[in-house]
Interface confidence: low
């Protein structure tokens, strides 16, 4: 006889409608019903639902939702799984890989990881490794074959040969980029001394008296003098390569200068031409600079002649330019001939032609154009409305129209409605609220009072601001909000303490630096006393500064 | 143990170029050193002009490099500075230094005694 | 060009008392750093090079330390003849020298 198959309880998952089914059970083998699994599980299938069929030997599938994990959860730094699934259900295995030059725990450029009741069964990790180097007429000081990022190798020199200048051990250390530098040693003998002067030039980095095999040595001309030659030397069998020559260049008549002058040019004139490599002073005239932005500099000669080759350029101030509305970031004050500098538009403001940002050029009557940036609006976002009018950017003052959806309204029995393109943006935003959730006015508190005219309805997140009368405190936020047809919770208003003549008197008493007959004090507020003249204090000394709470204040006495 | 000894002419006049010689005595200067120029404005703090290794590379204070010549001259044992365009800035006490025996850069561990050089016309 | 700060200018310390100059650089100059004493009338005398080691015949009260951008002259106690100008020097880049600190009885 087939045994029949009783309400299945589906761990981590439920039949679909179970309430109205739970009434047929126990079901006949042969009966098939649609399930589903909750989040992060799945159906023998893969998917979020299936069927579960009544067999002979009971429900089938047996577990009908399985774990599952994502590949989004494995965080692998210096790794990565190339299988293309995202998905894993549980029991199942996925491969990770380490980059080149990094390795698991256990050395491995591979390892795996299996999706578990509670999720993946470890982190993946690739460690960073060095392999053991080749060496170069040195050995290593320690065995193994591979090393952990920072761990150090101890490396010596065979015999007559040295790491640097009289060393001849020395470590290289595992580094993100391998190993901090190959362990070569070089022979004593194939040193070099500091590298050879030359005429009318020099090296450009700081010369030492002692280079190892295959340094480089940088040369440059002083000025005027061209360099022949390769520009590096390199140390090579104890000997340097053949040092670069500087050649002279050919000589420049008087220099022209437009908007500027040689010093003293009459007294030099006589000696013109000159030879390369000569040096002047000069000076450009008033709205003039130099290339480097000063009023005077040197001019030379060069083998193509005068350099600058235009002394003397003109300049446009930063402070002649008006920007209403707009700004430039920078920072310097002088701009020489040619060069542009760009300006940027405030938020909501825009060039002519719509952008941002613009640019002006100085040039030789000045500024090519002042920046202009003109006044924008954006279209909105509409809320339960649309606009009555195409068009996606507003100038100042242009008015958009704009309709509320059915069963909205913008305020009182109204369903159309404008705004305006002002200076800080549109007049106000293009909003229809459902008629239930308006507000009517805002509740009265005492000694208080709203500081704007109360209306009758108000649309939601409406808010209107209280204030106390004088001397009283305001306590809690002075904004209340319409939410959901209710105004949120108003502020109180805290009473202040009126110090009276009356009052100081009974006690003796008289405020400390002031004269006033009445005085009001704030909660909070410390109120200072003193003994009237020929009375004596009769009570503490900290009740002379006594403190306002809530229109309370204990007075000192005085007898 | 080695010495070094500056001489040269104690007034030189604006524009002109200053010349000092070095002489350097117990000892070669062809050994692993660099032979230097500071010099000490009156009343003011130690300033390095240059300096010139026996095979005639030399270094060069870089705001001074275009006034400054520097040579040696190894069959005398000795090395010379000239400041070329003198001025009254120029007016100091400037001493020869030898660096260290050594690494490839350092300190300065003989000096001459230093001489006077006042620029005026 | 590597700039290189003394402080303080002056330095007032009683004979007997230790007395810490200092100097910065601009950039680092690693250990390449040296101090030296100057008296009136004389030529500098080199008292630290490689920013801690002595040098011949320097007396055990002076030392140096530091690396970097930051270094100490330390002198533990001070003799009648410790009273004088001191300079510091940095050879990693060119050659600059500190203002100088004058060390004076107080």
């Known amino acids: 006889e087939v045994k029949p198959c009783d309400f299945p309880e589906i761990q981590h998952g439920g039949l679909y409608y179970k309430s109205l089914r739970r009434l047929y059970f126990p079901a006949a083998a042969g009966q098939s019903y649609s399930y589903y699994c909750d989040q992060n599980f799945v159906t023998p299938s893969g998917s979020y639902w299936d069927y579960i069929h009544c067999t002979q030997d009971g429900w089938s599938p047996t577990v009908p939702c399985l774990r599952t994990c994502s590949k989004s959860d494995v965080e692998i730094e210096n790794g990565f799984i190339s299988e293309s699934s995202s998905i894993y259900i549980l029991n199942e295995e996925t491969q990770y890989n380490c980059k080149p030059g990094y390795a698991t725990a256990e050395g491995n450029s591979s390892g795996s990881i299996t999706c578990l009741q509670n999720g993946w069964s470890t982190q993946p990790i690739c460690i960073k490794f060095c392999d053991m180097p080749v060496f170069e007429n040195s050995r290593a000081k320690s065995n193994g074959m591979w090393f952990k990022l920072h761990d150090t190798l101890d490396y010596e020199c065979y015999d007559g040969y040295e790491s640097s200048y009289g060393n001849t051990t020395d470590s290289i250390v595992c580094g993100e980029d391998g190993w901090s530098h190959l362990p070569t040693c070089y022979n004593s003998s194939e040193n070099c001394g500091p590298p050879p002067p030359i005429s009318n030039g020099d090296t450009t980095s700081f010369p030492q008296k002692v280079y190892l095999p295959w340094s480089r040595v940088e040369y440059q001309c002083q000025s005027y003098y061209e360099l022949q030659g390769s520009k590096y030397v390199t140390c090579s069998n104890g000997d340097w390569s053949e040092p670069p020559r500087c050649i002279s260049m050919k000589p420049c008549e008087f220099p022209e200068i437009q908007h500027g002058h040689l010093y003293y040019e009459n007294t030099r004139r006589p000696y013109f031409p000159v030879a390369t490599g000569q040096s002047y002073s000069y000076y450009c005239d008033q709205n003039f600079v130099t290339p480097s932005g000063s009023y005077w500099d040197y001019i030379h000669c060069t083998q193509d002649g005068w350099l600058p080759t235009v002394p003397c350029l003109r300049t446009c101030s930063k402070s002649d330019i008006e920007i209403e509305n707009g700004f430039i970031s920078e920072s310097s004050s002088i701009y020489i001939l040619n060069k542009e500098i760009q300006y940027k538009c405030k938020p909501g403001y825009a060039t002519a032609d719509g952008n941002s940002s613009g640019s002006i050029t100085c040039l030789q009557n000045g500024w090519s154009a002042q920046p202009i940036c003109i006044k924008f609006c954006d279209m909105p976002v509409f809320e339960n409305s649309r606009a009555k009018s195409n068009g996606m950017r507003f100038k100042l003052h242009d008015t958009l129209d704009y309709e509320c959806y059915d069963g909205y309204e913008i305020s009182y029995g109204n369903t159309t409605g404008s705004i305006v393109c002002g200076e800080d943006g549109w007049s106000h935003f293009p909003t229809c609220y459902n008629s239930s959730e308006k507000c009517g006015p805002p509740p009265p508190i005492s000694n208080g009072d709203t500081t704007s005219f109360l209306l009758k309805v108000y649309v939601p997140q409406s808010r209107v601001e209280y204030q106390c009368q004088s001397y009283y405190e305001l306590q809690g936020s002075n904004y209340v909000t319409c939410s959901n047809g209710e105004w949120s919770e108003p502020p109180r208003c805290i009473h202040p303490c009126i110090i009276t003549e009356e009052n100081m008197n009974k006690n003796n008493i008289q405020l400390k630096g002031k004269s006033d007959i009445k005085y009001y004090a704030k909660t909070g507020d410390t109120i200072e006393f003193m003994c009237k003249l020929g009375y004596n204090a009769n009570t503490s000394v900290l009740s002379f500064q006594a403190v306002c709470r809530e229109g309370i204040v204990e007075y000192p006495r005085c007898e | 143990q080695v010495q070094l000894q500056e001489s040269g002419p104690g007034l030189v006049k604006p524009s002109g170029t200053l010349s000092l010689t070095c002489a350097v005595s117990g000892g070669s200067i062809s050994s692993s050193n660099w032979w230097s120029w500071v010099r000490q404005s009156p009343g003011k703090g130690l300033e390095w002009i240059g300096e010139i290794y026996h095979t005639g590379s030399t270094n060069k204070k870089p705001s001074l490099k275009s006034r400054v010549i520097i040579s040696v001259d190894k069959s005398k044992n000795q090395f010379s500075l000239k400041l070329i365009s003198v001025n009254a800035a120029d007016t100091a006490i400037y001493y020869c230094a030898r660096d260290r025996e050594g690494g490839t850069t350092e300190a300065f561990d003989i000096w001459g005694q230093g001489t006077m050089v006042t620029v005026s016309s | 060009e590597i700039v290189m700060t003394q402080s303080p200018a002056t330095l007032s310390v009683s004979p007997g008392e230790r007395a810490t100059l200092s100097c910065r650089a601009s950039q680092s100059v690693s250990s390449n750093l040296a101090w030296y004493q100057q008296k009136p009338g004389q030529a500098p005398r080199l008292l630290i090079y490689?920013?801690?080691t002595r040098a011949t015949g320097i007396p055990v009260r002076f030392s140096g330390s530091g690396s970097g951008t930051q270094f100490t002259l330390t002198i533990s106690s001070l003799q009648s003849e410790d009273f004088a100008v001191y300079y510091c020097q940095q050879y990693d880049n060119w050659r600059t020298f500190g203002q100088g600190t004058r060390l004076e009885i107080k």
């Open positions: 490689g920013a801690s």
